[in-house]
């Protein structure tokens, strides 16, 4: 069943910069993503950004840049001007909507004890942290290898020293997936890597949309940073909430995506489906 994950990160380089990563894990198509802070959208929260797969993005201060990372995940960079860093104790919520099936939302925050550049799970999760496990495991393997080499050297000085092949460790082994199941859903969680579509297929706008949607910057070169991040961008730890069960299924036989004026889709992209309607184009 579809799930929503939310991760809040403090940038290691700039302590005043935060990034909210949100993603949808499931078989549906997203028609709109809303990021808010201080609570859920429509329930006391304040909108920070709205991302439309075709019309682009709109954002409000202190949001600095909102962008699609994949077809099912987004990131929002925030600039904290205050010295007291109020973001550290703030709840950030992401609402994923698939019209008309429904909307679901999940929230997360950066724990006060978080190290810069890392994000810890929002609630205690009884699993060994994969980053520590990976580092310890790798250290153990190296120590064992060194010991074994010394052992071989002592016992078989007449033999040439065997060459140690470098270990091709997948950087995903260093990723901590600290999933905190919602109280509402106790279903077993599936492998998050299996459901994220890592193809990067955003839509861009050549001009500002008449409804006020801002033009998207060209960002095809950006690497995804969600759970399906490429090996070149390992994430050391990830705190996450998952949403309650909900369903998203693409209705067969619907019209192809509507492209408004000045809209350019990336080639070979099968973006979220467009439900019958005008997307606000007049």
């Amino acid at each position: 069943t579809p799930e929503v994950w939310v991760q809040v990160q403090m940038e290691a380089t700039e302590l005043s910069s935060f990034t909210v990563h949100c993603g949808f894990l499931g078989p549906g198509s997203i028609s709109l993503v809303t990021v808010s802070w201080g609570g859920p959208d429509g329930a006391g929260g304040t909108k920070l950004a709205v991302l439309h797969p075709e019309l682009g993005t709109r954002q409000w201060a202190p949001a600095r840049q909102a962008r699609w990372e994949t077809q099912s995940s987004i990131s929002l960079a925030l600039e904290d001007s205050g010295a007291s860093s109020p973001f550290a104790n703030t709840t950030f919520c992401c609402k994923f909507a698939s019209f008309p099936e429904g909307s679901w939302e999940s929230c997360g925050s950066l724990p006060p004890s978080s190290d810069p550049g890392l994000s810890a799970p929002p609630t205690p999760v009884p699993i060994l942290r994969a980053d520590l496990a990976g580092i310890l495991g790798l250290s153990g393997v190296l120590l064992f290898g060194c010991g074994y080499l010394l052992h071989l050297l002592r016992r078989q000085k007449h033999r040439p020293t065997p060459r140690l092949q470098p270990s091709h460790t997948n950087s995903q082994a260093l990723t901590a997936q600290a999933w905190a199941p919602s109280q509402a859903s106790q279903a077993a969680l599936h492998d998050p890597y299996a459901t994220i579509n890592t193809s990067f297929c955003p839509a861009t706008l050549d001009t500002a949309h008449p409804n006020g949607w801002a033009s998207l910057p060209t960002h095809a070169a950006h690497q995804p940073q969600g759970p399906a991040a490429s090996a070149s961008t390992p994430i050391l730890a990830r705190g996450s909430f998952v949403s309650v069960e909900n369903g998203l299924y693409t209705q067969a036989g619907e019209r192809p995506p509507h492209t408004g004026p000045g809209l350019t889709l990336f080639p070979d992209c099968r973006g979220p489906r467009a439900v019958e309607g005008r997307f606000g184009v007049r």
Epitope: P100, Q251, G277, G280
Partner: antibody, heavy 122, light 106 residues
Framework: EVQLVQSGAEVKKPGASVKVSCKAS????????IYWVRQAPGQGLEWMGT????????SYNQKFRGRVTMTRDTSTSTVYMELSSLRSEDTAVYYC???????????????WGQGTLVTVSS | QIVLTQSPATLSLSPGERATLSCSAG?????MHWFQQKPGQAPRLLIY???NLASGVPARFSGSGSGTDYTLTISSLEPEDFAVYYC?????????FGQGTKLEIK
């Protein structure tokens, strides 16, 4: 307080059209979709369609395709459902409802209008 | 469209008893919503996404199921629980409701 207030009862002749309004208050109108459900006397519920109040997208039940039109007026926070080519079997109570957002660890609430009885009779 | 069949059509029970209402889908659906409707009133959401209680719904209500078979259970009936109950699927357009189960006092 969230409220959805619908227009009053209507009596129509076969072949005519009816336009039912649903005025929302107590929340940000464009934050929630509105869907319409009808219920014939003594019968069950039937989904007619949903409108995205923010983008004016609509999704209709194929059964009513071509006969139903849902629109919204953001200036008055009102949604309209128009049903044309009325026949006797369209006699029903028509409800508008605010679609709920499923949010982890927050209360999920739905809100409905009081219903509008539309009678189609010659 | 996906046809939802509720059973039984009418269920006669006494306060304090346990009620089990079933909803069978013509083809597999991902989840089920349940609504309660009392005479002269609009429906009210009880259970969303198969097993989650909507705001203000007493804990005696619970939902379960998967695939094509879903169940609404009321552990101990209160006088205000006697009403008509509808299941609804949103996995496939058009969204459909069951024909309803009338829960009446025996």
């Amino acid at each position: 307080e969230v409220q959805l207030v619908q227009s009053g009862a209507e009596v129509k002749k076969p072949g005519a059209s009816v336009k039912v309004s649903c005025k929302a208050s107590g929340y940000t109108f464009t934050d929630y979709w509105i869907y319409w459900v009808r219920q014939a006397p003594g019968q069950g519920l039937e989904w007619m369609g949903t409108i995205d109040t923010s983008e004016h997208k609509t999704s209709y039940n194929q059964k009513f395709r071509g006969r139903v039109t849902m629109t919204r007026d953001t200036s008055t926070s009102t949604v309209y459902m128009e049903l044309s080519s009325l026949r006797s079997e369209d006699t029903a109570v028509y409800y508008c409802a605010r679609d709920f957002i499923i949010t982890v660890n927050y209360p999920v609430v739905d809100y409905w209008g009081q219903g509008t009885l539309v009678t189609v009779s010659s | 469209q996906i046809v939802l069949t509720q059973s039984p059509a009418t269920l006669s029970l006494s306060p304090g008893e346990r009620a089990t209402l079933s909803c069978s889908a013509g083809s597999s659906v991902n989840y089920m919503h349940w609504f309660q409707q009392k005479p002269g009133q609009a429906p009210r959401l009880l259970i969303y996404s198969t097993s989650n209680l909507a705001s203000g719904v007493p804990a005696r209500f619970s939902g379960s199921g998967s695939g094509t078979d879903y169940t609404l259970t009321i552990s101990s009936l209160e006088p205000e629980d006697f009403a008509v109950y509808y299941c609804q699927q949103r996995s496939s357009l058009p969204f459909t409701f069951g024909q309803g189960t009338k829960l009446e006092i025996k």
